[in-house]
Interface confidence: low
């Protein structure tokens, strides 16, 4: 076992439990968590006589470290006297000593409330050349307090002689002022008034508010992602509450089902935002079957500062269904970036708008952080489309030059996924498109030859294609350009990818 120095704690009684006529009183010192033995405990009793007794060390079961208690009994005018317990642990270091100075008993006390107030802007909403912060320390049992100002957690060199204390009845209040230049205040630093009292720390912090006026509290309820619903088969819905003012009141998020059936156990997370507001999220696992069958889930948000509860509900989207079309393609090499390529995936004409997009390489899904996917947007028709963009490195495509863009959507059959493969260097690609739909068809615009199947090999134009404007009289998605092979004596092949 390695050497460990002790933690030292004073042991005192509550003052109210000591009879006023007591002629002697006992206090103690606990040294715990040390290894190896021994510790030496000595007492400084000032002008008073006292007897000491150090109990045998005991072994702490889990760690194998030791703990011991030393007791001091004093008589006489002990009430106003301070005592020092000195613990030495020579195995830690020949001069390792910890001193604890304390009185015989601990008084009940009312802790202070700490609040920072700041000076106003002028009538036009502009900051004056200097800003005053006032720290109000109020409602505490009279006693010694220490006030420290911090700037972004660092102690500031502040003249505290201006701090003033007043007493009202049995409680006291103190205030301390901090003057800042406009430059410091606008630098977006956080200022903290830290109060130490009876061995405890209390604090309040402030900083320049965000420029925009704070909005009211808003609540949002998400539907499960198709990925969680159909692939992982562990769908969740999330209730998000934003723009809460941090306060003592608790935000309650309560889940229910329209059917009245019980809900699963939810997980909750609170995050303080950079603008000082609080964001609360509650995530509820839902049954895959329940969701697909159309169960409605409700999130109820209550808070002491809200005039009424916020209710949000979510259920499976109704309306027509349409499976996504997936087109994947690679950008050509760009001068100066030979070792990187961008892959793009157009997923379109799907309904409803809920979709999950994944990229795979080597049969393994790439992390979400690797790709950037737009929010679903309406097409000119009734469906939706998204674009997804993935940057790949030479090392990756040299390892295996096949990347798959996969869409997870409820209308896709047979397994709620449609995927399309793409290669950086299509001529060298080893793999073909692994699609769960039939491969795209090449559109032939010559006589009656319509819709001949293209060789399945990724969405890449024929080497002799060039890009021309999409023509309305050609079949295929109207918003796509087409590539036309100009070879003489042959029917012109069109490529239904993006140019």
């Amino acid at each position: 076992a390695s050497t460990q120095s002790p933690s030292v704690f004073p042991l005192t009684r509550c003052c109210k439990n000591i009879p006023s006529n007591a002629t002697s009183v006992t206090l103690g010192c606990l040294a715990t968590g040390y290894f190896p033995e021994p510790v030496m405990v000595t007492w400084d009793t000032g002008s008073l006589n006292g007897t000491t007794m150090t109990l045998p060390a005991t072994t702490l079961t889990l760690s194998g470290h030791y703990a011991t208690i030393s007791l001091l009994t004093v008589s006489g005018a002990w009430a106003k006297q301070m005592f020092t317990c000195r613990v030495a642990h020579t195995p830690s270091s020949t001069d390792w000593v910890d001193n604890k100075t304390f009185s015989v008993c601990s008084r009940d006390f009312t802790p202070p409330t700490v609040k920072i107030l700041q000076s106003s802007c002028d009538g036009g909403g502009h900051f004056p050349p200097t800003i005053q912060l006032l720290c109000l320390v109020s409602g505490y049992t009279p006693g010694t307090i220490n006030i420290t100002w911090l700037e972004d957690g660092q102690v500031m060199d502040v003249d505290l002689s201006t701090a003033s204390t007043t007493q009202e009845g049995e409680l006291a209040s103190t205030q301390s002022e901090l003057t800042l230049s406009q430059k410091h205040w606008l630098s977006d630093r956080t200022y903290t008034c830290q109060v130490t009292y009876q061995g405890h720390t209390f604090e309040d912090s402030t900083k320049k508010c965000a420029d925009s006026n704070p909005r009211g509290v808003s609540a949002y309820l998400s539907r499960p992602s198709p990925f969680d619903l159909f692939i992982r088969k562990s769908p969740t819905i999330t209730c998000l509450v934003v723009d809460l003012a941090p306060s003592k009141g608790t935000v309650n998020l309560t889940w229910s089902r329209a059917s009245g059936k019980p809900v699963n156990h939810s997980t909750r997370k609170e995050e303080k935002q950079r603008n000082g507001t609080l964001t609360v999220t509650s995530t509820l696992p839902v049954g895959t079957r329940d969701w697909i069958e159309g169960e409605t889930y409700q999130c109820r948000v209550t808070h002491p500062h809200l005039p009424r509860a916020l209710m949000r509900s979510t259920t499976k989207t109704s309306g027509p269904r349409a499976a996504p079309e997936v087109y994947a393609f690679a950008t050509p090499e760009w001068p100066g970036s030979r070792d990187k390529r961008t892959l793009a995936c157009l997923i379109q004409n799907f309904m409803p708008e809920d979709i999950s997009v994944q990229w795979l390489h080597n049969e393994v899904q790439l992390p979400d952080a690797r790709h950037s996917t737009t929010q679903p947007r309406k097409t000119k028709g009734s469906g939706f489309f998204v674009f997804s963009r993935l940057e790949v490195t030479r090392a990756e495509w040299e390892q295996k030059d096949e990347f798959i863009c996969r869409a997870v959507h409820e209308a896709a059959s047979p397994s709620q996924t449609v995927q399309r493969a793409v290669s950086v260097n299509p001529g060298l690609a080893g793999g073909s498109a692994q699609s769960q739909r039939a491969p795209d068809r090449v559109l032939c615009h010559s006589g009656q030859q319509q819709g001949l199947p293209r060789a399945a090999g990724g969405s890449v134009p024929h080497p002799r294609c060039h890009c021309g404007a999409g023509r309305a009289d050609w079949p295929g998605p109207p918003e796509l350009d087409v590539c036309v092979e100009e070879a003489e004596g042959e029917a012109p092949w069109t490529w239904t990818g993006l140019c």
Epitope: F227, D228, R232, V364, Q365, L366, P367, D368, A369
Partner: nanobody, 124 residues
């Protein structure tokens, strides 16, 4: 394929520290989110911590917050787990894993596709 190898485990006193390493002997770790899981005798494998592929984001289980720190050196193809203030309940076999599902399900054992063989950590 990515092949992972953990190292750095051993026997340590309660309150002590250990640093585990997870290196890829085949394939590159630099483009993957990587997680550490642990499995105590007779218990299920559970999530410890995870770091994003860029190293900018990390997640921790409540039991290790403030004591464990995950980091990565993409140039060395290695992810590290610095474990401080170890407790007997940290005793387990520690596994590193490549995360299959991006930021979803980072605590989910099934959301990770490649695993190392594990390294034993014993806290006495």
């Amino acid at each position: 394929d990515v092949q992972l190898q953990e190292s750095g485990g051993g026997l340590v006193q309660a309150g002590g520290s250990l640093k585990l390493s997870c290196a890829a002997s085949r394939g590159s770790l630099s483009r993957w989110d990587v997680a550490w899981f642990r499995q105590a005798p007779g218990k299920e494998r559970s999530f410890v911590t995870r770091i994003s592929w860029s190293g900018t984001t990390s997640y921790y289980a409540d039991a290790v917050k403030g004591r464990f720190a995950i980091s990565r050196d993409n140039a060395k193809n290695t992810v590290y787990l610095q474990m401080n203030s170890l407790k007997p309940e940290d005793t387990a076999v520690y596994y590193c894993a490549v995360a299959l599902y991006g930021n979803r399900g980072y605590y989910d054992v099934n959301a990770h596709s490649y695993w190392g063989q594990g390294t034993q950590v014993t806290v006495s």
